[in-house]
Structure formats: structure tokens, C-alpha cells
């Protein structure tokens, strides 16, 4: 199982509660109530209050605001007030700031463009078997296999929309059911959400920076894991998505609309078409059992063909199998009759990098994800820059305030539903929520959007990535139409759903509590983040996809251990932190398990030997390359050519603090070693920059 | 321009074989079938059977099965028919004609004819 | 077998008049018929394939038509070349048949 962090003898205080509405900045008690932590996990803390279990608060005392993690910093501005500047200061300045923005919208431009790029180079490498994922006969029998396929899929080609277009023509064609669909959108639905979690990995260099960034990328990962947690057994049970998208398909008599606009691909496929072109049919064909379509090539040779449709010649056994009696003839040796046929000319070549190197689709894929990361990453740190070097002072408050102030008494509670409404219209403009999301998680991470503001953004932008779905569903043609339409309802629905179980009501916001929480593990052991990305991206969706082609029996027999014992886990959490006189003096913490089970400590001195051979190896190739050995090795002091990684490992070292007894059950991912840290110090801005 | 040349004629005694060749030229032979007919004198024509030369599948009539052998060769664009047991009534002029293959147009081009005469 | 049968054996008749032969096949042979021309001493040359369709070099003059059953060729005025015996043939089914042929001569 995955470790997780230190648990102390922490004893809780009843008696008192810090209140405080969730989504809000939670407020700063006393400096004196502050405890230095020692690194005895046995020792007794002082000073423990107890927060009720809708608190966003984590397991430690609230510390004064300066410290709190989770606080945006505060972007000084250096540089001269306007005012003082003179005529050639003045005209300097705004020529600089001209030329930040169009750097901003340049780099930003390659961003968006890399993400497409790095969504062609997955369906390269995985694409295939994605499409053999889908062949399975057992999705139709099994929700939790269709759930881990859509997962994998979705993971695999990097775009939801790619899956869900499979499975629309799937159902069109009556390979699968809509019953049997709605797992696999909801898996769908999660595996869409490692694409802003990758562009968080790339905020690794400094640490305060990362917590919110990783946070902020992971509260949608959360929210969708915990949609489904509930949503599915709910649908395996009463079948409502299907019942209510049915109704809705039949009571409209739908015509064909029109597609749905492509508005950031007019701008940005100019420039993807010429890095490499596909055909996104083949995996469609794989899918459909089609055996041709497992020798094509995904990557599409002729752009301009001419399809015509013409009677070929074809032998029959005899003249009696003949299509149409009058032509059907014999040349004395076979017998013949006329067919009709589409036939498909070659006429022009696509004009992209790899249309003549007939290089396999692994090959050109693997070139094209390392190439998309490297651009993916720089084109981040070079747009955490520039919004560093713009966002200091005066502009920074406006658009902080603007951005994450709610409305004013009592309309406050219609900010976060403002929020879930950008967040929609942002994607349709944009027509992918990986694109939004990925561009919110830079600005979450330099301190511009709180994780509180960028939740209802998220959750927006889930609605949004199906309601394109709709209109495309509307465009799609006579046969499946019902299919697709019923389709992009159901995952409508789902949403909708999901956030009317975890935003409304404050105390719901689990995803928040959550995302925080792994945002501070990450924050402090940063292979914590890769290894939650195999882990719930891949392992878990594989290792079920496993059991499930085993059979039910295995599936069960080895699921039902595994559940129960995260329920006694859970349970036992939850009795620790609310009546922990019920159980015998052993339970009521953690320490009766070995340190390993407990905490991350000895993992991370495991994972610190297995990468310390790569640390001077790696930090002084480049900058990029030292972020991914940060990533990796959490090296403190490897990086002597780049600062990167430096991180004032010793004042954090000093300075935890106290742990608060831990409260609910469902931030089981937080604790004092996880959170016990300074954030970096501010003047270290080598970290976001080249 | 397309050619069919055939052999010389042939004149054969009751019991005995002739193999009668038609050699082509100015197209792809084994994108065509060869066809052999035969004429009796002041008669119509009658078929007797054909070959594809890519894949030497071949056919005949039924009331020549057993007699008659087409065979062809590639490398010199050459097909053969062989006819065996000779009677007097086998007595005609031998005609190759070229079909092309997977294609209803029928016999468009033919040779210029063998005489072979069957006589004691 | 399919049996084509050919009327008139022979005809005679002026230059430029119409001529028009018919064949008639045993069974449908839908429009899988071919015209002949053999001149005397002469191996046969195709005039009009499937029926209707004159083939490259073959004259105007020169016209094909029917289906099923009963089949027509016709020559639109009739020249001197055109002395010779036509055949008709099926090839709807396997073996390839030929009609007895119409001998046209000119008065």
C-alpha cells in the first residue's frame, strides 16, 4: 500500500473550534501559540486545537499568516514607480511592457500548441492499444473495467475527447451499450485531469510555488476521483444518467447542427499541422475490431485525396451470385460482376516534419513527447517569468483582488457559481479543458488564483469540455446522433452531479482539503507527486483492468480486502480524532505501525539512494533537466551550476509546526511532516527562472 | 502495335498431337487471357478453351477436356495449345485471341490463324 | 450451353443501304454480347462488346443494341468494306459461344 505521512501522539481538544467559512483564507491566531516541532515523533504537543471536519484546515495549528503556506505571496515591485520615471523611462516602460506581452502571448501560444502536440505524441505511443483497451468483450458486463478503460484511454491519448468520440461511434455501431458507456466517461472524465497535473510537475523548482501549483492541478484529479467514488455505484444501482439522458433524447425531436466552433484551433493547428498530422480513425477502427487498422499508421501521409465512387470487376463462383443480373458476365475462365465501390486516390502529401521518414508510430511518437515536454516546460517557466516580472505591486493587488475577491454581503455565495460559469465559457472558447486547466495552474502556482478561486474554475471547466461535446454530438451524423447526444448528456449529468455533491455546501469541498494536503507532501518530498501520478493515473487502472480480465471472482477477492481495509483505516481515523477514548490506548495513534507504514521518511531516504547517483550527473545539463532532477531527488545542494534546487533546506529543517490532532477522516494525506515547513524564502527567484 | 503471331500450319495424321503457338507482343501479356478458337472450313467459330498466363489457371470446353492443353510462358509471352488424338473433323484454321483480363470487353484481338489439317 | 442463333444466314444487299442483323441467345444473357467481323480469309475482328459498346476504331456506321434475349446489329449504310461474315457471341456464361454468322454481300 502507499505509505503516507508521520501520524503523532497528537491529543485533540474537544472543547474548541476555529470556525471559519471554507474557501476563505483561513485567519492567523497567535504568534504565541506557535510550538517548535522536534523530530520525536513520540512526543507529546501542546497547544491542539480541534477543527470541525468542514474546516479546509490542516492537522497543524494555524500558523501567523506570513507562514502559512497556503497564503499568496505577496510580488513585491522593485523596479521604479511611474511617476518618477521620466519621458524616456516612461515611453522604455511601455515598449518593455509591450514586449512582455507579446513574449506572454507567444510563449503562450507555443503552450497551447505543445499540449496538442504532447496529446498526437500519446496517441503515437499508446494510441493502439488504447483502441485494444476498447475491444475488451468484458467493458459490457463490467462498470469498474469500462471506468479504468475509459482512465487508461483517456491517459493514453491524452484528450477526452478523443475516447469519448470512440466509444459515440462504438455505441453508434452497437458494440456497446449507453449502460456501458457511462463508466467509461466517467474514467474518461478522470484520465483528462493528468494533463494539468504534468504542467504542475514543471512548477517543481520552488517549493511554495509548487504546493499551490500541484494543488491547484490536483483538486480537479480529486474532484473527479471522488465524483466517481460516489457516482458510480449510484448509477450502477439506479441507471439515472442513462434514464434521464434518455428522456431528454427522445422528448426532442434534434436536428443536425452544425460543428462545434473550433475558435483556439483556428489559431493554433496553422502551426501543430506542420509539427505531425493524424489519423485519428485508426484507433476508431482498433476499437471496432477492425484487423486492417492494426498495421496503419497513425500518422496521416496524404492530406488531399479523391474519393471516387466506381464499379469495380469482381469474380463470384457463378453467374447466379451476380449482383445485378444484367452485369454478370464470364471470360471463359472466371465469371464476373460489377461492384460498387469507393475508391480513394492519393493526391497530395501532408506537408508535416515526419510525412517521409515512414518512421513507426512509437518511434515518432517518443520523439514528439520528449520534444513537447522540453517545450511544455520552458514555454511554463518563461510564462512564470514574465507574469513574475509583471505582476508585482500595484498590478498584482488589482488582479488578485479582482480575481479572488468575492461580492460583497449577501451575495457572496454567487462568486464561486460566477466562477463554475468563466470556467465553462472559458473552455468553450478554448474546447479543451486540459488547455484551460493547464493555463489555470501557473497562475494558481505563482500566487494569482487561489486553490479556493480556482476550484469553481475547474468544476466550470468540466461543464464547459460537455457542452462542446453536446454541440458536436448535435453536428454528428443521422446515425449517431442519438448515440453521441445521449452520450455527452450522460457525461453532462456526471458533472453537474459531481458538483452538486462537492461545491455547494462548504464543508463538502473535500477536493480542496485534499489537493491542499497532497500539495504539502509534494511540497516537501516532491517524488511524492510522480509517484501519485503512477500510482492513481496508471497502477491502480491497471492493476484493476488486470483483475477484471482474471473474472469477477478474483476482481472481488481481492478488492473486497483491499476496501476494507481503507474503510477500517478511515474509521479508525475518524475515531482517533473524534472519540479516541473508545479505543484501547494502542489505536489511538499510529505509532503501534512500523515507521515505514506511517511516514514518508524512509521512503524518501530510499528514493533519495536510488536517484543520488543521478544528481550531479543530471542537475549541470540544463536548467530544464535540473527541474526534472528536483522532481526526482529532491536534491538540496546538487545544482552548483543552476541555484534550481537550493532551497534553504535548513532553515525548514528547524522551524516545523506543531501537529494538530488529526480531525477527519478524509485528510488522511496530511500531516505534520508533510506541512511542517517555511515556505521558500521570496527573494529566491532563480526557481522560476531559466 | 499489339501482335499475335502464330505458328505455321501444320498437317497431322489421325491419333497424332499438334501444339500450335501464338507469340505476343506491344502489351502485358499476363494482364490479358489467351483465348483459342477454332474454325472448320466454311463453319462458325467455336471456342475451346483459355488460359491466364500470371496464374496458368485455365479453362475448356467441356467436349475438348481431356484433348486439349493450353499452357503459356511467361518469360517469352508465348501461349500453346495442344490438341491430341487428332480426327479429320479437328481439321480448321486455329485462331489465339487475347481477352482483357477482369475487364467485359471480349476478344480484341486475335491471330492470324494456323491450318491444321488432319488427314491419313 | 447457351445456343445463339443468328438470322439471316446471308443477306445481299446495295451500298449504302441499313443492314441489320439479329441474334437470338437460348436464355438471358443480359447485355454480356459481342459482335465479330471476318473477312474472307481474315481472322475475325471485334466490332461492339457488351452489347452496345463499339469498340476503338470501329465506325459510326457500326451499332449494337438489345438485352437479355434478342440482340441487334446494324449497319447504318453499308459500304463495300464491309463485305464479310458477322458472328455474335455470349459470354455470359462459361463456355463461350458463337452464332452460325450472317454473310453480307452487297448486290
Known amino acids: 500500500m502507499a505509505p503516507w505521512p508521520e501520524l503523532g501522539d497528537a491529543q485533540p481538544n474537544p472543547d474548541k473550534y476555529l470556525e471559519g467559512a471554507a474557501g476563505q483564507q483561513p485567519t492567523a491566531p497567535d504568534k504565541s501559540k506557535e510550538t517548535n516541532k522536534t523530530d520525536n515523533t513520540e512526543a507529546p504537543v501542546t497547544k491542539i486545537e480541534l477543527l470541525p471536519s468542514y474546516s479546509t484546515a490542516t492537522l497543524i495549528d494555524e500558523p501567523t499568516e506570513v507562514d502559512d503556506p497556503w497564503n499568496l505571496p505577496t510580488l513585491q515591485d522593485s523596479g521604479i514607480k511611474w511617476s518618477e520615471r521620466d519621458t524616456k523611462g516612461k515611453i522604455l516602460c511601455f515598449f518593455q511592457g509591450i514586449g512582455r506581452l507579446i513574449l506572454l502571448l507567444g510563449f503562450l501560444y507555443f503552450f497551447v500548441c505543445s499540449l496538442d502536440i504532447l496529446s498526437s505524441a500519446f496517441q503515437l505511443v499508446g494510441g493502439k492499444m488504447a483502441g485494444q483497451f476498447f475491444s475488451n468483450s468484458s467493458i459490457m458486463s463490467n462498470p469498474l473495467l469500462g471506468l479504468v478503460i475509459g482512465v487508461l484511454v483517456t491517459v493514453l491519448v491524452q484528450s477526452s475527447s478523443t475516447s469519448t468520440s470512440i466509444v459515440v461511434s462504438m455505441v453508434s455501431s452497437s458494440l456497446l451499450t449507453v449502460r456501458a458507456a457511462i463508466p467509461i466517461i466517467m474514467g474518461a472524465n478522470i484520465g483528462t485531469s493528468i494533463t494539468n497535473t504534468i504542467v504542475a510537475l514543471m512548477q517543481v523548482g520552488d517549493r511554495s510555488e509548487f504546493r499551490r501549483a500541484f494543488a491547484g492541478a490536483t483538486v480537479h484529479d480529486f474532484f473527479n476521483w471522488l465524483s466517481v467514488l460516489v457516482l458510480l455505484p449510484v448509477e450502477v444501482a439506479t441507471h439515472y444518467l442513462e434514464i434521464i439522458t434518455q428522456l431528454i433524447v427522445e422528448s426532442f425531436h434534434f436536428k443536425n447542427g452544425e460543428d462545434a466552433p473550433d475558435l483556439l484551433k483556428v489559431i493554433t493547428k496553422p502551426f501543430t499541422k506542420l509539427i505531425v498530422q493524424l489519423d485519428k480513425k485508426v484507433i476508431s477502427q482498433i476499437a471496432m475490431n477492425d484487423e486492417k487498422a492494426k498495421n496503419k499508421s497513425l500518422v496521416k501521409i496524404w492530406c488531399k485525396t479523391f474519393t471516387n465512387k466506381t464499379q469495380i470487376n469482381v469474380t463470384v463462383p457463378s453467374t447466379a451470385n451476380c449482383t445485378s443480373p444484367s452485369l454478370c458476365w464470364t471470360d471463359g475462365i472466371q465469371n464476373w460482376t460489377m461492384k460498387n465501390v469507393t475508391y480513394k486516390e492519393n493526391i497530395a502529401k501532408c506537408q508535416h516534419i515526419f510525412v517521409n521518414f515512414h518512421l513507426p508510430d512509437l518511434a515518432v511518437g517518443t520523439i514528439l513527447l520528449i520534444l513537447s515536454l522540453l517545450v511544455l516546460c520552458g514555454c511554463l517557466i518563461m510564462i512564470v517569468k514574465i507574469l513574475g516580472s509583471v505582476l508585482k505591486g500595484q498590478v498584482a493587488t488589482v488582479i488578485k483582488k479582482t480575481i479572488n475577491t468575492d461580492f460583497p454581503f449577501p451575495f457572496a455565495w454567487l462568486t464561486g457559481y460566477l466562477a463554475i460559469l468563466v470556467g465553462a465559457g472559458m473552455t468553450f472558447i478554448v474546447q479543451s479543458s486540459s488547455v484551460f486547466t493547464s493555463a489555470l495552474t501557473p497562475l494558481i502556482g505563482i500566487g494569482v488564483i487561489t486553490i479556493e478561486r480556482a476550484y469553481p474554475l475547474t468544476l466550470g471547466s468540466n461543464i464547459g469540455t460537455t457542452t462542446t461535446a453536446i454541440l458536436a454530438a448535435l453536428a454528428s451524423p443521422g446515425n449517431a446522433l442519438r448515440s453521441s447526444l445521449q452520450i455527452a448528456l450522460c457525461h453532462f449529468f456526471f458533472n453537474i452531479s459531481g458538483i452538486l455533491l462537492w461545491y455547494p455546501i462548504p464543508f463538502t469541498r473535500l477536493p480542496i482539503r485534499m489537493a491542499k494536503g497532497l500539495g504539502n507532501i509534494s511540497a516537501k518530498y516532491r517524488w511524492f507527486a510522480v509517484f501519485y501520478l503512477i500510482i492513481f493515473f496508471f497502477l491502480i487502472p491497471l492493476t484493476v483492468f488486470g483483475l477484471s480480465l482474471a473474472g469477477w471472482r478474483v476482481l472481488v477477492g481481492v478488492g473486497v480486502p483491499v476496501v476494507f481495509i481503507i474503510i477500517l483505516v478511515l474509521c479508525l481515523r475518524l475515531l482517533q480524532s473524534r472519540c479516541p477514548r473508545v479505543l484501547p490506548k494502542k489505536l489511538q495513534n499510529w505509532n503501534f505501525l512500523p515507521l515505514w507504514m506511517r511516514s514518508l521518511k524512509p521512503w524518501d531516504a530510499v528514493v533519495s539512494k536510488f536517484t543520488g547517483c543521478f544528481q550531479m550527473r543530471c542537475c549541470c545539463c540544463c536548467r530544464v533537466c535540473c527541474r526534472a532532477c528536483c522532481l526526482l531527488c529532491d536534491c538540496p545542494k546538487c545544482c552548483r551550476c543552476s541555484k534550481c534546487c537550493e532551497d534553504l533546506e535548513e532553515a525548514q529543517e528547524g522551524q516545523d509546526v506543531p501537529v494538530k490532532a488529526p480531525e477527519t477522516f478524509d485528510n488522511i494525506t496530511i500531516s505534520r511532516e508533510a506541512q511542517g515547513e517555511v515556505p521558500a524564502s521570496d527573494s529566491k527567484t532563480e526557481c522560476t527562472a531559466l | 502495335q499489339v501482335q499475335l503471331v502464330q505458328s505455321g500450319a501444320e498437317v497431322k495424321k489421325p491419333g497424332s498431337s499438334v501444339k500450335v503457338s501464338c507469340k505476343a507482343s506491344?502489351?502485358?501479356?499476363?494482364?490479358?487471357?489467351i483465348h483459342w478458337v477454332r474454325q472448320a472450313p466454311g463453319q462458325g467459330l467455336e471456342w475451346m478453351g483459355g488460359i491466364i498466363p500470371n496464374n496458368d489457371v485455365t479453362n475448356y470446353k467441356q467436349n475438348f477436356r481431356g484433348r486439349v492443353t493450353i499452357t503459356a510462358d511467361e518469360s517469352t509471352s508465348t501461349a500453346y495449345m495442344e490438341l491430341s488424338s487428332l480426327r479429320s473433323e479437328d481439321t480448321a484454321v486455329y485462331y489465339c485471341a487475347r481477352w482483357r483480363n477482369a475487364y467485359y470487353s471480349a476478344m480484341d484481338s486475335w491471330g492470324q490463324g494456323t491450318t491444321v489439317t488432319v488427314s491419313s | 450451353d447457351i445456343q445463339m442463333t443468328q438470322s439471316p444466314s446471308s443477306l445481299s444487299t446495295s451500298v449504302g443501304d441499313r443492314v441489320t442483323i439479329t441474334c437470338t441467345a437460348s436464355?438471358?444473357?443480359?447485355?454480356?454480347v459481342a459482335w465479330y467481323q471476318q473477312k474472307p480469309g481474315k481472322s475475325p475482328k471485334l466490332l461492339i462488346y457488351w452489347a452496345s459498346t463499339r469498340h476503338t476504331g470501329v465506325p459510326e456506321r457500326f451499332s449494337g443494341s438489345g438485352s437479355g434475349t434478342d440482340f441487334t446489329l446494324t449497319i447504318s449504310s453499308l459500304q463495300p468494306e464491309d463485305v464479310a461474315t458477322y458472328f455474335c457471341q455470349q459470354y455470359r456464361t462459361s463456355p463461350l459461344t458463337f452464332g452460325g454468322g450472317t454473310k453480307v454481300e452487297i448486290k
Open positions: 506491344g502489351f502485358f501479356f499476363t494482364e490479358y487471357i
Open positions: 436464355q438471358d444473357v443480359g447485355t454480356a
